[in-house]
C-alpha cells in the first residue's frame, strides 16, 4: 500500500514538475526589464528562450521570434537544449511510469518488470529535473553577469550631454517556475526510485543453473534466497558456487540492482 502511494505520488509530482518545465520553456518572461525604483514604465521589455516582447503603457504588446540560429548566443542555445532534453526525458519517463504503476494492470506483467520500469522512469525524472534546474541556473547566471555589466556602463554618451539609458534585465517568472518545476520532477524521480525498491519481488526465483563438473553433468536448481532490503553488507546472500557456473541466459545470480537504489 505504501509502495503504491509512494509510486503514485511520485508520478503525480513528476507530472506536475514536467508540466512546469514545459510551461517555463514556453514562457516569454525568462528575463524582464529591471524597473529600478520605478514600478510604472511606458515601455516594458521581457524576453524568453524563443522570442522577445515589448509591452507598452497603451496596452499593446508586440513579440518577435528569434528567427536565427547562428546569431544567438551559445549560452541561450545551451539553455534551450537543456530544457528540451529535460522535457523529452520527462515525457518518456511519464510514458514508462504509466505502465509501471502498480494500480494499473497490463496483461500478466510481473512485479519485477514494473520495478524495472519504475526505476527507469525515476532515473529519467531525476535527469529531467536536473536538466531543467541546470538550464534555468545557466540562464540566471547569464542574467546576473549581464546585469552587473550593464550597471557598470549604465549611462553612456558624449561628454555626458546626451544620455542613453541601457536596459537592464532581471529574473523573470519563468526562472522561478523552472526551478520549482525542476525540483518537483527531481523529487518525483527520487520517490519513484524509492517505490521501485518496494516493488522488487520478495522471492526471486532464478532459472536453472548448469554446473559442468569434471566427468559428469549435474543440473542444480537452487531454492532461491530472500532479496535484501538493506543497504548494508549483504552477509546472507552468499555466492552459490564459485566455479564456472552461469545461468542459462547470463542473468547473474547475485543481488539484483533493485537492492541498491
Amino acid at each position: 500500500m505504501a509502495v503504491t502511494a509512494c509510486q503514485g505520488l511520485g508520478f503525480v509530482v513528476s507530472l506536475i514538475g514536467i508540466a512546469g518545465i514545459i510551461a517555463a520553456t514556453c514562457m516569454d518572461q525568462w528575463s524582464t526589464q529591471d524597473l529600478y525604483n520605478n514600478p510604472v514604465t511606458a515601455v516594458f521589455n521581457y524576453q524568453g528562450l524563443w522570442r522577445s516582447c515589448v509591452r507598452e503603457s497603451s496596452g499593446f504588446t508586440e513579440c518577435r521570434g528569434y528567427f536565427t540560429l547562428l546569431g544567438l548566443p551559445a549560452m541561450l542555445q545551451a539553455v534551450r537544449a537543456l530544457m528540451i532534453v529535460g522535457i523529452v526525458l520527462g515525457a518518456i519517463g511519464l510514458l514508462v511510469s504509466i505502465f509501471a504503476l502498480k494500480c494499473i494492470r497490463i496483461g500478466s506483467m510481473e512485479d519485477s518488470a514494473k520495478a524495472n520500469m519504475t526505476l527507469t522512469s525515476g532515473i529519467m525524472f531525476i535527469v529531467s529535473g536536473l536538466c531543467a534546474i541546470a538550464g534555468v541556473s545557466v540562464f540566471a547566471n547569464m542574467l546576473v553577469t549581464n546585469f552587473w555589466m550593464s550597471t557598470a556602463n549604465m549611462y553612456t554618451g558624449m561628454g555626458g550631454m546626451v544620455q542613453t539609458v541601457q536596459t537592464r534585465y532581471t529574473f523573470g517568472a519563468a526562472l522561478f517556475v523552472g526551478w520549482v518545476a525542476g525540483g518537483l520532477t527531481l523529487i518525483g524521480g527520487v520517490m519513484m526510485c524509492i517505490a521501485c525498491r518496494g516493488l522488487a519481488p520478495e522471492e526471486t526465483n532464478y532459472k536453472a543453473v548448469s554446473y559442468h563438473a569434471s566427468g559428469h553433468s549435474v543440473a542444480y536448481k537452487p531454492g532461491g534466497f530472500k532479496a535484501s532490503t538493506g543497504f548494508g553488507s549483504n552477509t546472507k546472500n552468499k555466492k552459490i558456487y564459485d566455479g564456472g557456473a552461469r545461468t542459462e541466459d547470463e542473468v547473474q545470480s547475485y543481488p539484483s540492482k533493485h537492492d541498491y537504489v
Epitope: 515601455v43 507598452e56 497603451s58 496596452g59 539609458v165 541601457q166 536596459t167
Partner: antibody, heavy 115, light 113 residues
Framework: EVQLVESGGGLVQPGGSLRLSCAVS?????MNWVRQAPGKGLEWVAW????????TYADDFKGRFTISRDDSKNTLYLQMNSLRAEDTAVYYC???????????WGQGTLVTVSS | DIQMTQSPSSLSASVGDRVTITCKSS????????????LTWYQQKPGKAPKLLIY???TLESGVPSRFSGSGSGTDYTLTISSLQPEDFATYYC?????????FGQGTKVEIK
C-alpha cells in the same frame, strides 16, 4: 469608434478644487490627461491604466492632482486640488494607442483659476 | 525627465514647399527590445485638439496623408512634409513616448508665407 467627452471645467478661485470628467465610449486600455495653457504648448499631466487603476503623474502635479476612473460609468476623472493661476488651461483627455501615441482626444474643457 | 527640443519654433512656407521640422531629445528614445524609437508627432490647429500623425518615429497613423513622413533614431528626429498643402498650416509637436513623464516639444508653428 472611440469617443471622449470632457466636462467639469469652469472658473475656480486660487486654492480651490475642481473635478474634471471624461466620458469614454469604446475600448480603452489606458488614458491620459494633457493640458494646454492659453497660447502655450502641450503639457502631459497624468496617465492611468483603465483596468488596474494604476496611475502615474508628471512631477509638477504629484500630490495636487489625482487621476482615477469609474469602471461602472466608464468615466475618467482628474481631481485637481490647491489650484493656482498657472493651472489655467484647456484640459484634454486622450487615449493611449500603439507606440504610446495619443490617437483619440476629447474636445477639451477650459479651467480658469482666478480670483 | 527627458527634455524635448524642437526647431525651428516657427517657419513660413508656401503651398507645395518641402518642410522639415527637427526634434532633439535629451535621452535616446530607442528601445532595445524592439529597436523602435518612441517618438510621436502631432498636428494641432487653433481651437482644436491635437491629431496624431506619426508614432514609432516613422509609422504613419491611419488616415494621415502620405506627404507626412518621420525619420530618425536615438536622439535626433525629423518630421517632413513633402509638399505643403493649405490644410497643413498648423502647429506641430513632437513627444517622448518612451518613458514617463511623457514630455512634448515646445511646438513648431508652420505659417503661410
Amino acid at each position: 469608434e472611440v469617443q471622449l467627452v470632457e466636462s467639469g471645467g469652469g472658473l475656480v478661485q486660487p486654492g480651490g478644487s475642481l473635478r474634471l470628467s471624461c466620458a469614454v465610449s469604446g475600448y480603452t486600455f489606458s488614458m491620459n490627461w494633457v493640458r494646454q495653457a492659453p497660447g502655450k504648448g502641450l503639457e502631459w499631466v497624468a496617465w492611468i491604466n483603465m483596468y488596474t487603476g494604476e496611475p502615474t503623474y508628471a512631477d509638477d502635479f504629484k500630490g495636487r492632482f489625482t487621476i482615477s476612473r469609474d469602471d461602472s460609468k466608464n468615466t475618467l476623472y482628474l481631481q485637481m486640488n490647491s489650484l493656482r493661476a498657472e493651472d489655467t488651461a484647456v484640459y484634454y483627455c486622450a487615449r493611449s494607442s500603439r507606440g504610446n501615441g495619443f490617437d483619440y482626444w476629447g474636445q477639451g474643457t477650459l479651467v480658469t483659476v482666478s480670483s | 525627465d527627458i527634455q524635448m527640443t524642437q526647431s525651428p519654433s516657427s517657419l513660413s512656407a508656401s503651398v507645395g514647399d518641402r518642410v522639415t521640422i527637427t526634434c532633439k531629445s535629451s535621452q535616446s528614445l530607442l528601445n532595445s527590445g524592439n529597436q523602435k524609437s518612441y517618438l510621436t508627432w502631432y498636428q494641432q490647429k487653433p481651437g482644436k485638439a491635437p491629431k496624431l500623425l506619426i508614432y514609432w518615429a516613422s509609422t504613419l497613423e491611419s488616415g494621415v496623408p502620405s506627404r507626412f513622413s518621420g525619420s530618425g533614431s536615438g536622439t535626433d528626429y525629423t518630421l517632413t512634409i513633402s509638399s505643403l498643402q493649405p490644410e497643413d498650416f498648423a502647429t506641430y509637436y513632437c513627444q517622448n513616448a518612451y518613458s514617463f513623464p511623457f514630455t512634448f516639444g515646445q511646438g513648431t508653428k508652420v505659417e503661410i508665407k
